[in-house]
C-alpha cells in the first residue's frame, strides 16, 4: 500500500525537518540581531521520491514529467509546508525592539 | 543595486515559469481524464542563486547556510508561489464530470 511518509530510500534520507545550529555570523545577522545569539534553524532537507509527502497535484505532475524528461523537469523539492514563528531582539533606528517573524523556521515539510 | 529578478547566471537560467506540453499518458491521467487530451503544464524550473526571488526570510537563511555547509544544507529551490486553476473533464463512478483543480498549474515562482 502507498505510504506517503515511508521513505523508500532508507530512514532519514527523504524530505523531513532538520535542525541546524547557526550563529548570528553564520546567518549574516550579526549586524542587526542581538538575541538569540545562536539560532536553531529548522529547515526541510531530503529527497522527494515518487509519492513521498506530495504537497498537491502539481507535485504529482512534476514527478511524472521528471521521470519522462529528467533533463528538462527537475524532481519535486523538499520545502516547508508551514512555519513556526520566531522572536528576535534586533537593532532599530531608535534603539532595540522585539520582532516576531512568521516565515523563518520550518514547522513541517512536503514535496512540491 | 540588488535586484531580486535579475538572474546573475544569464537569461532564462534562474527560477521562472516554464510551460511543458504533456499528453494524458505522460501525466499518468489517461485512465481517468477525458479532456483536455494535451495539457500545457506551467511549472517552476531554474536555479536559485543568492537573493534571487527569495520567498521569505527562511529562503535567505537557507542560502546563507548553504554557502557555509553546501554538503549539509541544499540551496533554495524553485517552487510555485501561487497556482492557476484548471478544469478537467473526468470519469466518475456515475459517468463524467467537470472538476476544477486549484493546485495544478503554477502561476508564478519563487525560491524557498
Amino acid at each position: 500500500a502507498r505510504n506517503g511518509d515511508r521513505c523508500p530510500l532508507g530512514p532519514g534520507r527523504c524530505c523531513r525537518l532538520h535542525t541546524v545550529h547557526a550563529s548570528l555570523e553564520d546567518l549574516g545577522w550579526a549586524d542587526w540581531v542581538l538575541s538569540p545569539r545562536e539560532v536553531q534553524v529548522t529547515m526541510c532537507i531530503g529527497a522527494c521520491p515518487s509519492q513521498f509527502r506530495e504537497a498537491n497535484m502539481h507535485a504529482q505532475i512534476k514527478m511524472n514529467l521528471h521521470r519522462l524528461k529528467p533533463d528538462t523537469v527537475p524532481a519535486p523539492c523538499c520545502v516547508p509546508a508551514s512555519y513556526n514563528p520566531m522572536v528576535l531582539i534586533q537593532k532599530t533606528d531608535t534603539g532595540v525592539s522585539l520582532q516576531t517573524y512568521d516565515d523563518l523556521l520550518a514547522k513541517d515539510c512536503h514535496c512540491v | 543595486a540588488r535586484n531580486g529578478d535579475r538572474c546573475p547566471l544569464g537569461p532564462g537560467r534562474c527560477c521562472r515559469l516554464h510551460t511543458v506540453h504533456a499528453s494524458l499518458e505522460d501525466l499518468g491521467w489517461a485512465d481517468w481524464v477525458l479532456s483536455p487530451r494535451e495539457v500545457q503544464v506551467t511549472m517552476c524550473i531554474g536555479a536559485c542563486p543568492s537573493q534571487f526571488r527569495e520567498a521569505n526570510m527562511h529562503a535567505q537563511i537557507k542560502m546563507n547556510l548553504h554557502r557555509l555547509k553546501p554538503d549539509t544544507v541544499p540551496a533554495p529551490c524553485c517552487v510555485p508561489a501561487s497556482y492557476n486553476p484548471m478544469v478537467l473533464i473526468q470519469k466518475t463512478d456515475t459517468g463524467v464530470s467537470l472538476q476544477t483543480y486549484d493546485d495544478l498549474l503554477a502561476k508564478d515562482c519563487h525560491c524557498v
Epitope: 538575541s35 538569540p36 545569539r37 545562536e38 536553531q40 513556526n84 514563528p85 522572536v87 531582539i89 | -
Partner: antibody
Framework: QVQLQESGPGLVKPSQTLSLTCTVS??????????WTWIRQHPGKGLEWIGA???????VYNPSLKSRVTISVDTSKNQFSLKLSSVTAADTAVYYC???????????WGQGTLVTVSS | DIVMTQSPLSLPVTPGEPASISCRSS???????????LDWYLQKPGQSPQLLIY???NRASGVPDRFSGSGSGTDFTLKISRVEAEDVGVYYC?????????FGGGTKVEIK
C-alpha cells in the same frame, strides 16, 4: 497575551524527586527564539536560574544543578517540566517558570509555586 | 560564573524624589556587538519578578519612562527619576552575557 502556570506537589520528601509542570496558554510553546526557563527563589533570598529548554527539546542547565536537573517539553500539551532529583532542605524554594529570549528578557513569568522539602 | 553585586542592600526613598541602584559584574558584560547584556527586574511584594530594562538601557514594553538603565562594561545603574509608591519592592540586576545567567543579591526599595 501569554500566561504561564506552574503546577505540582508543594511538599517533597528528602532524597525524592521534585516534579513541576508549567502550562503555557495564550501562545504556542513552538515559537522560535524563546527559551522556556525555570528559576527559583529560596525563602527571603535572591533568584537562581535553574535551566531552560527550547521547543525543539535542546536544553541548557546551571552547572551547579546539572547533575540533578532534567527539563523536558511536551509541545502537544503546550507544557514544559522540571525534575530535580535527590532533593534536600536546601531545595526548598519558590519555583517560577518564565519565558525568555535566550538567557534574557524574561517578560512573562508564572506566579510561582512554593515547594517545601521536608520529611 | 559571573558574579553580580548590588548596592545598596536597602534603599529608603521619598515619593517624588529620585533613586539610584548600582550593579557591578565580576567581568565585562559588553558584547562585541556594542551592547551590554544586562537586565533589570523588579519584584513587588508577593509577586513574580517583572522585566524593567534589557540590554543595559532598553525599557521593556509597558515600563514607565521614569525608569532608566545606564552603564557599560562592569558598572551599571538603574535610576528612577521620581519614585512612586508603587515602585516599592526588590530590584535585581541579571547578567545575560553567558550561561548560566546570574542575578545580583537584590536592592530593597521602601518608602521612608
Amino acid at each position: 497575551q501569554v500566561q504561564l502556570q506552574e503546577s505540582g506537589p508543594g511538599l517533597v520528601k528528602p532524597s525524592q524527586t521534585l516534579s513541576l509542570t508549567c502550562t503555557v496558554s495564550g501562545g504556542s510553546i513552538n515559537s522560535g527564539g524563546y527559551y522556556w526557563t525555570w528559576i527559583r527563589q529560596h525563602p527571603g533570598k535572591g533568584l537562581e536560574w535553574i535551566g531552560a529548554i527550547y521547543y525543539s527539546g535542546s536544553t541548557v542547565y546551571n552547572p551547579s544543578l546539572k547533575s540533578r536537573v532534567t527539563i523536558s517539553v511536551d509541545t502537544s500539551k503546550n507544557q514544559f517540566s522540571l525534575k530535580l532529583s535527590s532533593v534536600t532542605a536546601a531545595d526548598t524554594a519558590v519555583y517560577y517558570c518564565a519565558r525568555g529570549v535566550e538567557y534574557q528578557h524574561f517578560n512573562e513569568w508564572g506566579q510561582g509555586t512554593l515547594v517545601t522539602v521536608s520529611s | 560564573d559571573i558574579v553580580m553585586t548590588q548596592s545598596p542592600l536597602s534603599l529608603p526613598v521619598t515619593p517624588g524624589e529620585p533613586a539610584s541602584i548600582s550593579c557591578r559584574s565580576s567581568q565585562s558584560l559588553l558584547h562585541s556587538n556594542g551592547y551590554n547584556y544586562l537586565d533589570w527586574y523588579l519584584q513587588k511584594p508577593g509577586q513574580s519578578p517583572q522585566l524593567l530594562i534589557y540590554l543595559g538601557s532598553n525599557r521593556a514594553s509597558g515600563v514607565p519612562d521614569r525608569f532608566s538603565g545606564s552603564g557599560s562594561g562592569t558598572d551599571f545603574t538603574l535610576k528612577i527619576s521620581r519614585v512612586e509608591a508603587e515602585d516599592v519592592g526588590v530590584y535585581y540586576c541579571m547578567q545575560t552575557l553567558e550561561a548560566p545567567p546570574t542575578f545580583g543579591g537584590g536592592t530593597k526599595v521602601e518608602i521612608k
